[in-house]
């Protein structure tokens, strides 16, 4: 056969799988002789043991026989199967040859494995002997497990293959093998050709792109040729029949299987993989040995073969960068007007939805960030007491507040409401004061003097004061936020000099002080300053952090206090506080 390599003719420059604008387009591997250089398994080869064979020639009416020896052990006299698929030089023909006179019902088979699916255009055999009287070509699409007929040749189709002679091919039966008597002449006695064209006479051949039936019909992983009956001159049963019988055998100089590596229009070449198997070098986001499926995460539309008009590339699922996996749902694809059928799986970053395109319950969209951002969804942080639920408005982040509660996270009482001790109704209406008494506002108390003594900031620290309090800590005020009836200070606890039953840890914590205490400057506290805080254990609104009130001591920090406080700490450990 012609020595075309599988990989020959690959142009280096333009990409066959995309156009000049970079858009995908159909691409197909080069047309090759898929049989070239491949091993052919044969059921019979002459020469083991060495045997005589005779070649018949004709001169006018006269029949001449020249006899030779076939010897498999002598390279000069051997006719091995390798000669079927070697370089076919018409000036130096090499022929595979079967044993003599394997006549019907015995047959001789040639089996060629292509190693992968090919789209076969033709199967041809060039003979050194006369062509067979009956012969069948079969194909396998499953690597030789099952075989289906491709074509039959016989002068007696019905008798040999139980097939009608030259049955018409219609759209209804175009994927069926037919039987013909063409190419079955005994002459020429040598050099005759049998060529089967897979699409010849098939009605849909002109519209091959749109004919799944014919696409299937031309697909093969293996080809088998079965020689069923030898042509004879009718002298094989005469007295001197041994010479005649030695003249009848099958001999083939060239077996060709013309076609292309099957890649469904999604690859321009086939290559060897790590296992040395032939596979398509898939493009258009496809995968598989025949580019017959979409590669992972490219399931937004169903896999389709490329056509001359449409590349039908696989499309990535749109998961807005929040999912790594998706699956195809045909019904959703159809419902979308055949645009998108990918369903994202396991949306991350607190997103949800078919495309991970909205925030999951308990989160809302940060409109300052694109939906593809890792932090596009922010936690609602609805106040556990003030909010009526954990789900907030997807766009504004507003939590559903209980009666009388306000704020985006429902963390403070609305105007005209005051904090209660009930978690069910955390804010209750401020009772309207009778006309005789002056109504007092929680926000700005009118009589701070009667409420508490504002610290002047020059307080002294002694053992007695240290012992009276449950905890003593050095704090750095970082920021302050209003939270209903409370102020929430974010503080950094630098040192812990005393702690009660609730363990106080160093690091960032919340310090809670009632709004009224702050309004009356008991204690007086400013952000970004460092303080010594002595206070009593009390439950904070968020069940963590510490509480200070009008009875707490908050004194601007002096470094000289560190040693004194360590002393107090040691004394306390020795039980001195109980005496004090």
């Amino acid at each position: 056969g012609p020595g075309l390599s599988m990989f020959a003719g690959q142009a280096a420059q333009p990409d066959p799988c995309s156009d000049e604008n970079g858009h995908p387009r159909r691409c197909i591997p080069d047309f090759v002789n898929a049989a070239f250089g491949k091993d052919v398994r044969v059921s019979s080869t002459c020469g083991r043991p060495p045997a005589r064979y005779c070649v018949v020639s004709e001169r006018g009416e006269e029949r001449l026989r020249s006899c030779h020896l076939c010897n498999a052990s002598d390279p000069k006299k051997a006719h091995p199967p390798a000669f079927l698929t070697d370089l076919n030089n018409p000036h130096n023909l090499t022929c595979w040859q079967s044993e003599n006179y394997l006549q019907f019902p015995h047959n001789v088979t040639l089996t060629l494995s292509l190693g992968k699916k090919f789209e076969v255009t033709y199967v041809s055999l060039q003979f050194c002997s006369p062509r067979p009287e009956s012969m069948a070509i079969y194909k396998s699409m499953d690597y030789g497990r099952t075989w289906v007929p491709f074509q039959f040749y016989s002068t007696q189709c019905r008798k040999m293959y139980n097939r009608p002679h030259r049955a018409p091919i219609t759209k209804q039966n175009e994927q069926e093998a037919v039987c013909t008597d063409s190419h079955t002449d005994m002459r020429p006695l040598s050099g005759g050709l049998i060529a089967f064209s897979t699409l010849d006479g098939r009605p849909s051949a002109h519209d091959f792109d749109n004919s799944p039936v014919l696409q299937d019909w031309v697909t093969a992983t293996d080809i088998r040729v079965a020689f069923s009956r030898l042509h004879t001159f009718g002298d094989e049963n005469e007295d001197d029949s041994e010479l005649a019988r030695d003249s009848y055998f099958y001999a083939v100089s060239d077996l060709q299987v013309g076609g292309r590596c099957k890649c469904n229009g999604h690859a321009a070449r086939c290559v060897r993989d790590r296992d040395d198997s032939l596979v398509c070098d898939c493009r258009h986001n496809t995968a598989g040995p025949e580019c017959d499926r979409c590669k992972p995460f490219h399931y937004d539309r169903p896999w389709q073969r490329a056509t001359a008009r449409e590349a039908n590339e696989c499309v990535a699922c749109n998961c807005n960068l929040h999912a790594r996996r998706c699956r195809f749902n045909m019904e959703l694809y159809k419902l979308s007007g055949r645009k998108s059928g990918g369903v994202c799986l396991n949306c991350r970053h607190n997103t949800a939805g078919r495309h991970c395109h909205y925030c999951k319950e308990g989160y809302y969209r940060d409109m300052g960030k694109p939906i593809t951002h890792r932090k596009a969804c922010k936690a609602c942080d609805c106040h556990p007491v003030g909010a009526a639920g954990k789900t907030c408005n997807q766009t504004t982040g507003q939590c559903p507040c209980k009666d009388g509660v306000t704020g985006i996270t429902c963390n403070r009482c609305a105007k005209g409401y005051q904090q209660s001790r009930s978690p069910i109704a955390p804010c209750i209406k401020i009772p309207v004061a009778p006309p005789t008494t002056a109504a007092s506002s929680v926000e700005e108390p009118e009589d701070c003097d009667s409420y508490c003594k504002a610290s002047k900031g020059k307080l002294k620290i002694n053992m007695k004061k240290y012992c009276k309090k449950d905890y003593a800590v050095q704090i750095h005020i970082l920021k302050a936020d209003k939270a209903g009836d409370w102020w929430k200070f974010t503080v950094n606890i630098i040192s812990v000099y005393k702690q009660g039953t609730s363990r106080i840890r160093r690091g960032d914590q919340s310090l809670w002080i009632r709004s009224r205490d702050i309004a009356c400057k008991c204690p007086k506290i400013k952000p970004l300053k460092k303080y010594l805080l002595l206070g009593n254990a009390e439950d904070s609104p968020d069940q963590s952090g510490i509480v200070a009130d009008k009875s707490s001591l908050v004194i601007q920090w002096r470094d000289t206090w560190a040693r004194r406080l360590r002393k107090f700490q040691q004394r306390e450990k020795k039980g001195k506080c109980k005496k004090a």
Partner: antibody, heavy 109, light 101 residues
Amino acid sequence: QVQLQQSGPGLVKPSQTLSLTCAISGYTFTSYNMHWIRQPPGKGLEWIGAIYPGNGDTSYNQKFKGRVTITADKSTSTAYMELSSLRSEDTAVYYCARGGTGFAYWGQG
Amino acid sequence: DIQMTQSPSSLSASVGDRVTITCKASQSVSNDVAWYQQKPGQAPRLLIYYASNRYTGIPPRFSGSGYGTDFTLTINNIESEDAAYYFCQQDYSSPWTFGQG
């Protein structure tokens, strides 16, 4: 076995809203689309819309857009359909049906 | 919307007959066609999906064929229990549409 159990009022007055429920059992609710189809007396079938309970995606027949709402509750494996602003032409038997390859399973209507 | 036109609108047959119902789509719907049988007071029952696949439990006398725009439901050797309304339906493109039955 697969079952689709429908419930809802037998009769709704014009201009009001029809609310129907379809409770499923026997398969994974989130794996199949749930469709709503109606059939006026003595007439053919008409597709109203569908929901993919896996993520709440809906698709509606344009003819009903704005009047129909289909929802699903994964926790109870139940689909719901509401059709508002009812008129006399909306008189029909309403079915829920499981999607897939054809409507193999239907509610009783 | 894709229109599905069924014919004939009604027909009568004798037990053992072969009956053919056709359905024509207003545009190509590939093989995305299903056939249903409906008896009075009952929900429809799926017979055929993807134009030619018989649904589980449907007797072999029911068969479907067609591709593109022309589809056929054939009932061979018809039985008295087959008296019913028959609908075709396309699910090629939203909105899903049915034949008039």
